[in-house]
């Protein structure tokens, strides 16, 4: 009787952990940053090197795919930088932006969950320019939904893993 | 039999809470902000007054020490400010930055987990200047590892507890 | 005996979830943004449309009310923007700020938990200006306490739900 109770306990303990809580922390893959100054989707991210990691979520085709319904905290940190040694900026007035979007495959549609950024005047009087954006929020995500990151001026992205990354972790079940 | 089951239950309930989940929210100790205009480590933080608090983590020698393996959400908010009543800025072009670093004592090494900030032009045309940085991310931390904060231009830090702080809370066990 | 054990288990499982963990994600209600350039409290937020949602917390009189003691992660994302088509700015030197405040009704007092922002020079040389602030932190909240958002220059707020929002989710009980 005791053994059986303990056995069913461990089952429940595992279930009460709602399987293992999903998470991801994805860092920019600098070998494949798209060019351009307009809004583009960033599709190249690391998921298994350095600080990057993923569990009970999937990374595919540049998107973070939800495998488990729940409420998740989503975040992104995006750094832009320019040094005069890399040449002059085509324009000194820049719009440096990030958009965290959710795509549902069942109902093909894409919606922006969070946005952040700034217009900047990066004048030639300074040899180095830097700017970081951080956004975060709590969202209900369903299995199969996909999270992706869009930025303006991707050619200015800082390629360091501590600079440009995004992630998610599950906080709570959907009732 | 029932009493025994209930007893072992409470043990499991406690264990399933993985002891009490660690957290910390540390606020800047303005009485001891280091000087310098280059990158310096901030070692003076409050852990037990106002909004500052700590549980199942340790604060020692300016570092937040992990006592329990796990996945943690780390965050930092750093505010810089200057008012002309305190004098002039020696340079109007500033690099206002924060670096959240992890140090492992076992393998003496320090790595930046997150960085953020901006280059700023704080011209003498304005009597007051302000800028805040926020960074956050989800990281695997092992017992004994240490989290610390480095900033540029510490003499410009806003000393308020609502302005300059960092923290961590455990979200999940390592499988 | 087995049925009884399993029954008390489900009770404990529910109790161990400490009721359902509270959360809220509130998005700006753009139909009712106050005017002015000084610090004002934002009282109009959505709690049940689009990304906005609330559970085991209450939204009343422009404040997010805590119903359950605990440690919460609080966050806010505030976007400011201006396009020349909407007219000229009265001043090009702006202080764009957010303050996340906690009010206790028992001891009528209001305290700032987090602040962020930047002084900006939004010159007439550019037709569009944008700036976002993000703050986040981990705080002990008691039932009945209220969270509210104050900003400077509310007339410059970006009214999109992905731009201007704040929220909270409970991470842990108070021991």
């Amino acid at each position: 009787e005791k053994a059986m109770v303990d056995g069913s306990w461990l089952d429940l303990a595992k279930r009460s952990k709602l399987e293992a809580q999903p998470f991801a922390h994805l860092t920019i893959n600098a070998t494949d940053i798209p060019s351009g100054s307009h809004k583009v989707s960033l599709s190249s991210w690391y998921h298994d090197r350095g600080w990057a990691k993923i569990s009970n979520m999937t990374f595919s085709n540049g998107k973070l795919i939800v495998n488990q319904d729940g409420f998740y905290y989503l975040y992104a940190n995006i750094c832009f930088r320019h040094h005069e040694t890399s040449g002059d900026l085509a324009t000194e007035y820049l719009q440096l932006m990030v958009y965290v979007t959710k795509t549902s495959i069942k109902i093909p549609s894409s919606h922006t969950l969070m946005k952040g950024g700034s217009t900047k005047y990066w004048s030639g009087n300074s040899e180095f320019h830097f700017y970081s954006i951080n956004v975060g929020g709590f969202f209900k995500l369903r299995s199969g939904e996909e999270i992706s990151i869009e930025v303006s001026n991707p050619s200015l992205l800082d390629p360091d893993q501590d600079a440009t990354y995004f992630g998610a972790f599950k906080v709570r079940d959907i009732d | 039999e029932k009493a025994m089951v209930d007893g072992s239950w409470l043990d499991l309930a406690k264990r399933s809470k993985l002891e009490a989940q660690p957290f910390a929210h540390l606020t800047i100790n303005a009485t001891d902000i280091p000087s310098g205009s280059h990158k310096v480590s901030l070692s003076s933080w409050y852990h037990d007054r106002g909004w500052a608090k700590i549980s199942n983590m340790t604060f020692s020698n300016g570092k937040l020490i992990v006592n329990q393996d796990g996945f943690y959400y780390l965050y930092a908010n750093i505010c810089f400010r200057h008012h002309e009543t305190s004098g002039d800025l020696a340079t109007e072009y500033l690099q206002l930055m924060v670096y959240v670093t992890k140090t492992s004592i076992k393998i003496p090494s320090s790595h930046t987990l997150m960085k953020g900030g901006s280059t700023k032009y704080w011209s003498g045309n304005s009597e007051f200047h302000f800028y805040s940085i926020n960074v956050g991310g989800f990281f695997k931390l092992r017992s004994g590892e240490e989290i610390s904060i480095e900033v540029s231009n510490p003499s410009l830090l806003d000393p308020d507890q609502d302005a300059t702080y960092f923290g961590a809370f455990k979200v999940r066990d390592i499988d | 005996e087995k049925a009884m054990v399993d029954g008390s288990w489900l009770d404990l499982a529910k109790r161990s979830k400490l009721e359902a963990q509270p959360f809220a994600h509130l998005t700006i209600n753009a139909t009712d943004i106050p005017s002015g350039s000084h610090k004002v409290s934002l009282s109009s937020w959505y709690h049940d449309r689009g990304w906005a949602k609330i559970s085991n917390m209450t939204f009343s009189n422009g404040k997010l009310i805590v119903n359950q003691d605990g440690f919460y992660y609080l966050y806010a994302n505030i976007c400011f923007r201006h396009h020349e088509t909407s007219g000229d700015l009265a001043t090009e030197y702006l202080q764009l700020m957010v303050y996340v405040t906690k009010t206790s009704i028992k001891i009528p007092s209001s305290h700032t938990l987090m602040k962020g922002g930047s002084t900006k020079y939004w010159s007439g040389n550019s037709e569009f200006h944008f700036y976002s602030i993000n703050v986040g932190g981990f705080f002990k909240l008691r039932s009945g306490e209220e969270i509210s958002i104050e900003v400077s220059n509310p007339s410059l707020l970006d009214p999109d739900q992905d731009a201007t929002y704040f929220g909270a989710f409970k991470v842990r009980d108070i021991d």
Partner: antibody, heavy 126, light 103 residues
Framework: QVQLVQSGAEVRKPGASVKVSCKAS????????IHWVRQAPGQRLEWMGW????????KFSQKFQGRITVTRDTAASTAYMELRSLRSEDTAVYYC???????????????????WGQGTLVTVSS | EIVMTQSPSSLSASVGDRVTITCRAS??????LNWYQLKPGKAPRLLIY???SLQSGVPSRFSGSGSGAEFTLTISSLQPEDIATYYC?????FGQGTKVEIK
């Protein structure tokens, strides 16, 4: 010990220019700012401008903008103040003074002057 | 532009007297106020910085107090060598000076 030694007295005609030097010794010249302050007969002390000896950045009082140039020679640990288009009301004792804030320890020009030169009398007369 | 106003403009006191000079700022300047001593033909000397901090080498009979917009310099026991003009200063603005003489 810290010393600031200024050049000698000068007499100029209206419309002319004057250049006063200030040689520093006893400290790392590049780590501090040098201010220029003057006192006309019977008047209060009047701040004119500063130079960050490390990077050469300058700031001037609105009153002297366009007429004043402040430079430095780090190799010679010397700061210079040139005032152009002199008029009779520029007759004054001109002082250089070191800002007490060490630039290595921060980036604020603190505006408290811990060491002063002996002063240079400039007389503007036709 | 902040304006600094000192009072009195001159005073006469006996050796050993306690002497107080007041300085008012046209707006709040926190504690960013300094005091200097100026003797004819000599370089000015920093006495007090940050409203109340005594500069190294300055006799302890000199003290400063105040914050916001009102400040005082006190000489607890006037000495013959204290005959001078005293100036308050906040960043770019100086007071008009207070001339101290011996009776």
């Amino acid at each position: 010990q810290v010393q600031l030694v200024q050049s000698g007295a000068e007499v100029r005609k209206p419309g002319a220019s004057v250049k006063v030097s200030c040689k520093a010794s006893g400290y790392d010249f590049s780590n501090y700012a040098i201010h220029w302050v003057r006192q006309a007969p019977g008047q209060r002390l009047e701040w004119m401008g500063w130079i960050n000896a490390g990077n050469g950045n300058t700031k001037f009082s609105q009153k002297f903008q366009g007429r004043i140039t402040v430079t430095r020679d780090t190799a010679a640990s010397t700061a210079y103040m040139e005032l152009r288009s002199l008029r009779s009301e520029d007759t004054a004792v001109y002082y250089c003074a070191r800002d007490a804030a060490n630039m290595v320890r921060g980036i604020i020009i603190a505006y408290y002057f811990d060491y002063w030169g002996q002063g240079t009398l400039v007389t503007v007369s036709s | 532009e902040i304006v600094m106003t000192q009072s009195p403009s001159s005073l006469s006191a006996s050796v050993g007297d306690r002497v107080t000079i007041t300085c008012r700022a046209s707006q709040s300047i926190s504690r960013y106020l300094n005091w200097y001593q100026l003797k004819p033909g000599k370089a000015p000397r920093l006495l007090i910085y940050g409203a109340s901090s005594l500069q190294s080498g300055v006799p302890s009979r000199f003290s400063g107090s105040g914050s916001g917009a009102e400040f005082t310099l006190t000489i607890s026991s006037l000495q013959p060598e204290d005959i001078a003009t005293y100036y308050c200063q906040h960043t770019r603005a100086f007071g008009q000076g207070t001339k101290v003489e011996i009776k």
